[in-house]
Amino acid sequence: DPVKPSRGPLVTCTCESPHCKGPTCRGAWCTVVLVREEGRHPQEHRGCGNLHRELCRGRPTEFVNHYCCDSHLCNHNVSLVLEATQPPSEQPGTDGQ
């Protein structure tokens, strides 16, 4: 089969999530995603990004915060916070545009 798409140099990242196959992964960039679902404590996942870099530009909300970086294991010690709860009229959207 033909080779996979050329995506430039890959970086090694810390991988900490239920779907990690090991302690590290390789991708175009490293990610940290902090998510709070209704009625649950926030969960922080670390991993690799290869697609839809626009999510890295999204503003933090009371439910989610995305962080991206581009160097070796750069996501290892990053800690994220969520926005404080705001009145509905002031809530930032999660839309990455």
Partner: antibody, heavy 118, light 108 residues
Amino acid sequence: QVQLQESGPGLVKPSQTLSLTCTVSGGSISSGDYYWNWIRQHPGKGLEWIGYIYYSGSTYYNPSLKSRVTISVDTSKNQFSLKLSSVTAADTAVYYCARESTDGMDVWGQGTTVTVSS
Amino acid sequence: ESVLTQSPGTLSLSPGERATLSCRASQSVSSSYLAWYQQKPGQAPRLLIYGVSSRATGIPDRFSGSGSGTDFTLTISRLEPEDFAVYYCQQYGSSPITFGQGTRLEIK
């Protein structure tokens, strides 16, 4: 293997909100490797991308529809949903949900036809 | 936003012939995230090619993709009766995701 199934009303009145749900079976919607998309196809026309949602709840929408679209995810039910407000006859289409990764949109629902009419 | 233009709009060929479908992007496709889909009447699109040239699972090797930058090609080396359908290219490297308008491959 992973399968997607769209569900929702087949008939919506003008000015109302179209609501559809996509149920994911055979795999977890919470995988960080995938993005969950809505696409539509007007009768006899091509494919129009509506938007996607990530497991985190982060979204990105087609700029031409952004003001009317909301996509949400319910990881506990392994579902994601589409809401399109203020519909007109021009929103009559077949609506598809699809799973996307670096390997393209490899899994699609069978599509559901939505007609906007009074 | 990357606009994808497919040509020709309709291609009339006979089984056994070679089909060449073109897709041109208005700007360079990010990280080679260019896919091709086949759609038959009343069915959902089916992924054929992703990442410009990688065949999706279960796709016969008569389908191949090539190209780079802004110009891409889907080639069907020897047409089978079941290949007559509409084909769409898609870029998914940067949002908004966009599709070409489609090429209809019909039996001559």
